[in-house]
């Protein structure tokens, strides 16, 4: 499948984050997987996702740096090809945002795609 | 006392293969990220691979990419490297290091030399 | 992909000195700045991590600043075991990770 697009970054509350993407087909046979990492990290902490294009982050620091990235892959239970997509581009988001009130809480894209 | 130690490296020929190793103690090691960085003789650092703690995602160098391999075994405490088709360029001391961005701890180095 | 461009290539100072070694990003990395140290024929030594923290075990005469593009590594009074070469690297666009050209640090 294409690597995921569009990813945007909203505050579900004063400690939780959620993170939305786009798939060019949307499909139930689809699985995710999400990376995140804050500026403190030394490595990626990784959560699988199902079908739905959403991730939630229950627990955030607001002193800290976010960054997330997506890939995607049809899931083996459906007989299809398991390979994983490519990274998304990465979608970074800082204490400044979580601050902030509005519900769209990162604007800032890299535009660089991310290879496994 | 945490340590990284190399091994593997030699003089090789244009095109040709080696697998470094890298032997992890004294911190847990599928709790990190790791890396390779080389450092060519009395040149800089140079960052050209890393995977993820489970060994499920890796990222590589363009100057690297298609040519080198970058693998764990965390039951052994391991973190591999196999490179091919190897170009005069290649030439350096390879570091592995604990991190997938960030590089806590460092091994001494393995020293790989490409020569006709 | 990011260049990081440290400045100056090369410093001479004298053991007491305060020393300013400094790191610009061609775009911004927020605060994904690490910094090394590397003592001939030695590993590096990770320092400084998200631009300002401390690494654990470092003496605090070293500290880090800077946010965006620009960002500097200090050694408020320089010791004997502190001349050795500098790096900075970034994190914030991987990959790939990319590092500065380094800084060496020697004795007047």
């Known amino acids: 499948p294409w690597a995921p697009e569009n990813l945007t970054l909203h505050k579900l509350s004063e400690s939780q984050l959620e993170l939305n993407w786009n798939n060019r087909f949307l499909n139930h046979c689809l699985e995710h997987l999400v990376q995140y990492r804050t500026d403190w990290d030394h490595s990626w902490t990784e959560q699988s996702v199902d079908y739905r294009h959403k991730f939630s982050l229950p627990s955030v620091d607001g002193q800290k740096r976010y960054t997330f990235r997506v890939r995607s892959r049809f899931n083996p239970l459906c007989g299809s090809a398991q390979h994983w997509s490519e990274w998304s581009e990465q979608k970074l988001i800082s204490e400044e945002d979580l601050g902030g009130e509005q519900k769209l809480i990162s604007e800032e894209d890299l535009h660089h795609h991310h290879h496994h | 006392e945490v340590q990284l130690v190399e091994s593997g490296g030699g003089v090789v020929r244009p095109g040709g293969s080696l697998r470094l190793s890298c032997a992890a103690s004294?911190?847990?090691?599928?709790?990190?990220?790791m890396s390779w960085v080389r450092q060519a003789p009395g040149k800089g650092l140079e960052w050209i691979s890393s995977?993820?703690?489970?060994?499920?995602?890796?990222d590589y160098a363009d100057s690297v990419k298609g040519r080198f391999t970058i693998s764990r075994d965390n039951a052994k405490n391991s973190l591999f490297l196999q490179m091919s088709s190897l170009r005069a360029e290649d030439t350096a001391l390879y570091h592995c290091?604990?991190?997938?961005?960030?590089?806590?701890?460092w091994g001494q180095g393995t020293l790989v030399t490409v020569s006709s | 992909d990011i260049q990081m461009t440290q400045s100056p290539s090369s410093l001479s100072a004298s053991v007491g000195d305060r020393v300013t070694i400094t790191c610009r990003a061609s775009?911004?990395?927020?605060?994904?700045l690490n910094w090394y140290q590397q003592k001939p024929g030695k590993a590096p030594k990770l320092l400084i991590y998200?631009?300002?923290s401390l690494q654990s075990g470092v003496p605090s005469r070293f500290s880090g600043s800077g946010s965006g593009t620009d960002f500097t590594l200090t050694i408020s009074s320089l010791q004997p075991e502190d001349f050795a070469t500098y790096y900075c690297?970034?994190?914030?666009?991987?990959?790939?990770?990319?590092f500065g050209q380094g800084t060496r640090l020697e004795i007047k």
């Open positions: 995977i993820n703690r489970n060994g499920g995602s890796a």
């Open positions: 290091a604990s991190g997938e961005f960030r590089f806590d701890y």
């Open positions: 690297q970034q994190s914030y666009s991987t990959p790939p990770i990319t």
């Open positions: 004294g911190f847990t090691f599928d709790d990190y990220g």
């Open positions: 775009q911004s990395i927020s605060s994904y």
């Open positions: 998200a631009a300002s």
